[in-house]
Interface confidence: medium
């Protein structure tokens, strides 16, 4: 049986916790990073879709992020296998209601940070 | 755009006490982990400690040198940080820097002199 | 706990040479929080790189960051008039929380 932290929803053997408020994505995996946690990796369409249906409309951060010219990258450094399209010209990326997109890593949204859930 | 806003150093004597203040301006400064580093003339930067937004609990944590005589505090209401400066040393002395916790934004720093 | 140490303390070049400043971690520390930093003469400290990597918003391509592990290096490609200034490496996290910064490199005009 999953178990997850307190406030963290359980979903395919990953705990992820969703944000009330707003940071930059540089202060939202601070945050994640102080809970042993990163900002969400996405890793399949169904944990996209999870993530797309409960999180509300709001904007959430993730854990892509690109230098200039470079490809996408998760947190932990493995490249993005393009599992589903991100819009827009920004170095950090985030779900809104349609599906991912990407900002400046300087504005402020909510987020989602990820880790893997405990099994007891 | 962001600004943080440092007034409050000054002139104090060993043993003295001396409160900093940083206003800060175009982010959600409630949301926002906030640190204070410093520089002695001369030398490099050092981190003093920093404080979590109260929603995620608000805690402090300090640098060795500082503990049990500095507190930082805030006032959300205010946007306003503080550094609150108990038994002042001479090795003290130094511009103080508000910072954003993720250090992309800076004060101008104020001057802290502690001497007799 | 981690210290920073930079290498060479005074860098002497002339305007439109390469700078290559070395930034050396006693432990393996995470690229996501090693940033490096610009101070001029009275005043506060600017950010250029974070992540190791990324620039900073207004950074100019000339400087670039690059490294993992524990050995981590800014670049200047083509120097200007206005870089000459003392440069900061810093590793910031939360394990410990607060941040430590590496002790300086002078960039001079040589």
């Known amino acids: 049986q999953a178990a997850c932290p307190e406030s963290w929803i359980g979903f395919q053997r990953k705990c992820f916790y969703f944000s009330d408020d707003t940071k930059n994505w540089t202060s939202s995996q601070r945050f994640c990073d102080s809970q042993d946690a990163d900002l969400a990796q996405v890793e399949s369409f169904q944990e996209l879709n999870f993530l797309l249906r409960y999180k509300g409309p709001s904007d959430h951060w993730i854990g892509l992020s690109r230098e200039q010219g470079q490809p996408w990258k998760w947190i932990n450094g493995t490249e993005w296998t393009r599992q589903f399209p991100i819009l827009g010209a920004g170095e950090c990326a985030y779900l809104n209601d349609k599906g991912a997109s990407s900002a400046r890593h300087y504005t402020e949204r909510k987020w989602i940070c990820s880790k893997s859930d405990i099994h007891v | 755009q962001v600004q943080l806003v440092q007034s409050g150093g000054g002139l104090v004597k060993p043993g003295g006490s001396l409160r900093l203040s940083c206003a800060a301006s175009g982010f959600t400064f409630s949301n926002a982990w906030m640190s204070w580093v410093r520089q002695a003339p001369g030398k490099g930067l050092e981190w003093v400690g920093r404080i979590k937004s109260k929603t995620d609990g608000g805690t402090t944590d300090y640098a060795a040198p500082v503990k049990g005589r500095f507190t930082i505090s805030r006032d959300d209401s205010k946007n306003t940080l503080y550094l609150q400066m108990n038994s002042l040393k001479t090795e003290d002395t130094a511009v103080y820097y508000c910072?954003?916790?993720?250090?992309?934004?800076w004060g101008q720093g104020t001057l802290v002199t502690v001497s007799s | 706990e981690t210290t920073l140490t930079q290498s060479p303390g005074t860098l002497s070049l002339s305007p439109g040479e390469r700078a290559t400043l070395s930034c050396r971690a006693s432990q393996s520390i995470s690229s996501t929080y090693l940033a490096w930093y610009q101070q001029k003469p009275g005043q506060a400290p600017r950010l250029l790189i974070y992540g190791a990597s990324t620039r900073a918003t207004g950074i100019p391509d000339r400087f670039s960051g690059s490294g993992s592990g524990t050995d981590f290096t800014l670049s200047i490609s083509r120097l200007e008039p206005e870089d000459f200034a003392v440069y900061y490496c810093q590793q910031y996290g939360n394990s410990p929380p607060g941040a430590t910064f590496g002790q300086g490199t002078r960039l001079e005009i040589k």
């Open positions: 910072t954003t916790d993720e250090y992309f934004y």
